[in-house]
Interface confidence: low
């Protein structure tokens, strides 16, 4: 029967991932043991690898919420073309049952005592509420149980008392004129304002509270003309140490405008608050090393074999780079000096080729010469062998990517009389002159 074929099996969830398509046989789908299949959409997902038991599922909830019950868990034989341990066919479930107890005892409801007395009214004048309470102890509930209904109830109450009126301040009156005409005299100039406890006045019977706080307030006068004082520079401070350990740096002296400080709108000190000097450590600065670009990959070879070209035999190749420019105890280059990779050699291998699409148009050449043209190409592109993209070279080192290397000999049918490259050229239009932008600005 045809099945749905997938490219991945997720061990943790037991789900099929990456649908490849339907209408294929299990045998064809499982030519790749990394694949998985389902007999119908949403059905059980089976991986193509040889069968083995899945992880145990989590335990199902306990069959009862209190006292002793039991709970199940399962695992499934998943895979294809074989049996799990115990000679069990794929798809078979194996169950485990264990005793469980979420809570030792089951809750029992309690009963209320009689209502207690009413508490005093919540206010001492006008209307409020009063409350009474009862206890859940007749009998007390067991094992986390409770009593039905509310533990307290409330009702309205009236004290039959008139509430007193408390005093509140009316708005402030205007400020009185200032007591002096300028700052800096023997007496600090002040202004005053007052307010009345009349919004409302406190009641007499029953007696209300008087207004809190003072009926008067004072403040310093603002906006009076001060006597301006011009600022003056203090002495130059010490020269700061040279801030660098190599090459040239800059030291600094500072002074402060505080002899005297400018006051009452007086002018700030004229001139600079800092001055700088060059300092020379006479020590060259370290220069860190920088990697050159990687060199060419060495030929793809395998030890003790004369040639592995045109064969599905992985080899190794390396490339190197040089750390240049390190001076005066600068940092060494970080990283590896040599890079090694696995490879298939296709050096001089005759490979079937196919013509590429047209490349994008290239740059106009020559850019500053007469009659520049641009070109595009179609290349005879080799069809690379379908060798495994990864190999396991040494036990325990995992899978390694394998790269094709070498100069194959692609073979394409002739196109416009060419076997390897077809080129089309066009003239470039409306070509501007090449001018040095620096000279244009002058």
């Amino acid at each position: 029967d045809p099945v749905l074929c997938f490219t991945q099996y997720e061990e943790s969830s037991g789900k099929c991932k990456g649908l490849l398509g339907g209408g294929v046989s299990v045998e064809d789908c499982c030519l790749n043991t990394a694949f998985a299949y389902q007999k119908r959409s949403g059905g059980l997902c089976q991986p193509c690898r040889s069968p083995r038991w899945s992880l145990w599922s989590t335990w199902a909830p306990c069959s009862v919420t209190c006292s002793e019950g039991s709970q199940l868990r399962y695992r499934r034989c998943v895979g294809w073309n074989g049996q799990c341990s115990g000679k069990v066919a794929p798809g078979t479930l194996e169950w485990q049952l264990q005793a469980c107890e979420d809570q030792q005892c089951c809750p029992e409801m309690g009963g209320w005592s009689g209502w207690g007395p009413w508490e005093p009214c919540s206010v001492t004048c006008s209307k409020g509420t009063r409350t009474r309470r009862r206890a859940c102890n007749h009998p007390a509930p067991k094992c986390g149980g409770h009593c039905p209904g509310q533990a307290q109830e409330s009702e309205a109450c009236d004290t039959q008392q008139v509430c007193p009126t408390h005093g509140a301040w009316a708005t402030w009156g205007p400020w009185t004129p200032c007591s002096a005409s300028c700052h800096g005299g023997p007496h600090e100039p002040k202004e005053t304002r007052s307010r009345k406890c009349s919004a409302p006045e406190p009641s007499q019977k029953p007696p209300g509270k008087p207004c809190p706080g003072l009926a008067y307030e004072q403040r310093r006068c603002t906006g009076l003309p001060p006597c301006p004082v011009a600022g003056g520079w203090g002495p130059w401070g010490p020269v700061s140490p040279c801030p660098v350990t190599c090459g040239l740096g800059q030291t600094m002296e500072q002074r402060t405008c505080n002899h005297p400080v400018p006051q009452h709108g007086g002018p700030f000190c004229a001139g600079d608050a800092t001055r700088t000097h060059i300092c020379n450590t006479a020590v060259p600065c370290p220069v860190d090393g920088e990697w050159d670009s990687w060199g060419e990959w060495s030929p793809c070879i395998r030890r003790n074999m004369k040639s592995i070209s045109c064969q599905e035999i992985p080899g190794q190749q390396s490339r190197g780079r040089t750390c240049r420019g390190r001076k005066f105890d600068g940092h060494r280059c970080a990283g590896q000096q040599q890079d090694i990779r696995h490879c298939y050699s296709i050096q001089h291998c005759p490979l079937k080729g196919s013509w590429s699409e047209w490349s994008t148009w290239g740059l106009c050449m020559p850019p500053c010469g007469p009659n520049p043209t641009r070109a595009r190409q179609r290349l005879c592109t080799p069809l690379l062998p379908k060798y495994p993209p990864t190999v396991s070279m040494v036990e325990g080192q995992g899978e390694k990517n394998v790269t094709f290397w070498g100069r194959p000999l692609p073979r394409c049918e002739e196109l416009q009389g060419q076997k390897l490259v077809v080129e089309e050229k066009r003239p470039c239009l409306h070509v501007p002159a090449c001018k040095d932008p620096e000279e244009e600005e002058l």
Epitope: G295, E296, W297, S298, P299, R319, S356, G362, L363, M365, A375, Q377, L379, C380, T381, P382, L384, T403, F404, R407, P408, P410, L420, V421
Partner: nanobody
Framework: QVQVVESGGGLRQTGGSLRLSCTAS????????MAWYRQAPGKQRELVAE???????VYADSVKGRFTISRDSAKNTVTLQMNSLKSEDTAVYYC?????????????WGQGTQVTVSS
């Protein structure tokens, strides 16, 4: 367009020496392989010597020990030093430049330079 230009051909006595040079120029990116091929009258074109960008060399059995190929990758130039010339070395020598990566390649040929070895 990429141009491949050879120079240095000529007439030599048996046992003599000759040095061929070749430059690839124009719209050229990195040249992976550069090689010398030759074609004697009435024969197929055959590989003489080849050198990769990193300097790996391949020689035809008939020229091993007598010819040396070298190149300047930065300038895309290749040189063939031919010593102990034999009459069977007489042929038109063609320079070949190959640009190649995982996705395709393009091969460029020079016009050829005549080498004649007389006894």
């Amino acid at each position: 367009q990429v141009q491949v230009v050879e120079s240095g051909g000529g007439l030599r006595q048996t046992g003599g020496s000759l040095r061929l040079s070749c430059t690839a120029s124009g719209r050229i990116f990195e040249v992976n392989m550069m090689a010398w091929y030759r074609q004697a009258p009435g024969k197929q074109r055959e590989l003489v010597a080849e050198i990769s960008r990193v300097g790996t060399t391949v020689y035809a059995d008939s020229v091993k020990g007598r010819f040396t190929i070298s190149r300047d990758s930065a300038k895309n130039t290749v040189t063939l030093q031919m010593n102990s010339l034999k009459s069977e070395d007489t042929a038109v020598y063609y320079c070949n430049a190959l640009q190649y990566d995982r996705y395709g390649g393009a091969e460029y040929w020079g016009q050829g330079t005549q080498v004649t070895v007389s006894s």
